[in-house]
């Protein structure tokens, strides 16, 4: 008789999840030799231990602490790029500007990027059928708690000038409910962080509005200022040109506003 299985509203664990995490770990430690001390089998065991045999709506940050410890990594605290709803451009940017880091440029972020996972209470099985949806099922699910944990730690590590890339094409350029708005903003350390600089990325080619005056950006400025952190904002009118100028800063067309 097949055992009854909880049906969740979200997609199930990414196929070949264990193999993917292990392979990503090995690849990351090769690309980043300063992390060559990491034992990827131990990393996978710690990752697995965070959610296997646990109810997927009852995961805590504490469950991920062994993984956090194994994945401890130093990134230059003044070279951190946060992002919200514009992941691809943020990643394209750090692939060119190699001394800056998004969360997904760190080991733990790299391991989990675009993956889904969950287990089942009292069984060692991984659930490949369905996993809890943050809205429809529960917020304390394995994926959401993981990103909340690593995002908090990443923001806490930041110092000096912290940059954030925001999507100017969205109705809420700054969304209080995003990971950036709900976790990272509130975990920047005022004693270490001098300024949060927002880069608002424009979508339309003819869009010349000053999106730094958007009400949601003003809301972000208010939250940041109340935390005794300075705020600045720049419009990136031409993201394609912006990336090109990061690649070739000496190009004569890169002196004008982008």
């Amino acid at each position: 008789v097949p055992r009854w299985r909880q049906q969740w509203s979200g997609p199930g664990t990414t196929k070949r999840f264990p193999e993917t995490v292990l392979a990503r770990c090995v690849k990351y430690t090769e690309i980043h030799p300063e992390m060559r001390h990491v034992d990827c089998q131990s990393v996978w065991d710690a990752f697995k231990g965070a959610f296997i045999s646990k109810h997927p709506c009852n995961i805590t940050e504490e469950d991920y602490q062994p993984l956090m410890k194994l994945g401890t990594q130093t990134v230059p605290c003044n070279k951190i790029l946060l992002w919200s709803r514009i992941k691809d451009l943020a990643h394209q940017f750090t692939q060119v500007q190699r001394d800056m880091f998004t969360l997904e440029d760190t080991l733990l972020g790299y391991l989990a990027d675009d993956l889904t996972w969950c287990g089942e209470f009292n069984t060692s099985k991984i659930n490949y059928q369905s996993c809890p949806d943050w809205r429809k099922d529960c917020s304390n699910n394995p994926v959401s708690v993981f990103w909340k944990t690593v995002s908090r730690r990443f923001a806490e590590a930041a110092c000096d000038v912290v940059h954030v890339m925001l999507n100017g094409s969205r109705s809420k350029i700054f969304d209080k409910n995003s990971t950036f708005g709900s976790v990272e903003v509130h975990n920047l350390q005022p004693e270490k962080v001098q300024t949060l600089e927002a880069w608002v990325i424009h979508g339309g080619r003819e869009d010349s509005r000053d999106l730094c005056q958007d009400p949601t950006i003003k809301e972000l400025e208010s939250i940041i200022s109340k935390r005794n952190i300075q705020f600045s904002c720049k419009n990136i009118y031409r993201p394609d040109k912006f990336l090109q100028c990061v690649k070739n800063p000496e190009d004569s067309s890169c002196t004008s506003e982008i």
Partner: antibody
Framework: SVEESGGRLVTPGTPLTLTCTAS????????MSWVRQAPGKGLEWIGF?????ITYYASWARGRFTISKTSTAVDLKITSPTTEDTATYFC???????????WGPGTLVTVSS | AQVLTQTPSSVSAAVGGTVTINCQAS????????LSWFQQKSGQPPKLLIY???SLASGVPSRFSGSGSGTQFTLTISGVQSDDAASYYC?????????????FGGGTEVVVK
Amino acid sequence: SVEESGGRLVTPGTPLTLTCTASGFSLSSYYMSWVRQAPGKGLEWIGFISKTAITYYASWARGRFTISKTSTAVDLKITSPTTEDTATYFCARVDAYSAGDLWGPGTLVTVSS
Amino acid sequence: AQVLTQTPSSVSAAVGGTVTINCQASQSVYSDNRLSWFQQKSGQPPKLLIYSTSSLASGVPSRFSGSGSGTQFTLTISGVQSDDAASYYCQGEFICTSADCFVFGGGTEVVVK
């Protein structure tokens, strides 16, 4: 242990390949580094090769050297030697936390016309 | 590029005395502690003494010790013995994607009287 070979007298511009042979451990389990030392001078890191053959070079060494590996050896090619490349070349096994826990005795390269 | 500056370039010590060698990095080493010390005797390859700032490599006598963090590091030889006459090099590690992975200091010659 590790041992370097291939060092000799060459004329400027003549490519030269040095070989590092490992025994007692597998090259697929370690990064391997090349370091050089000009006569009477200090140590200079050239570059290293990862377990899966990804290479990293010192900024000054890029384009001047090529590191490659087989299952049994790691090679360092000096693409176009100049007199400044006269040095003893060391191969070292890179451990988890340092540039080398196991070094070869070195091989001397002399570049002279 | 990152630079590791070692001071002094040469130091003389009596048997039983103490030697202190300083190593200053132009930027913080990886994790604030990825700094190693090597000993090199004439005609020999370098030998790893200390890794991760203060951890003693296997078989290294406890009279060698390391300390420091970030950009400032020190190697101390307490109760110097005649066998300690050698050149000493610090070596820092940095994030490879944005800098040279490994950089050596210029070296310090220790003379034992």
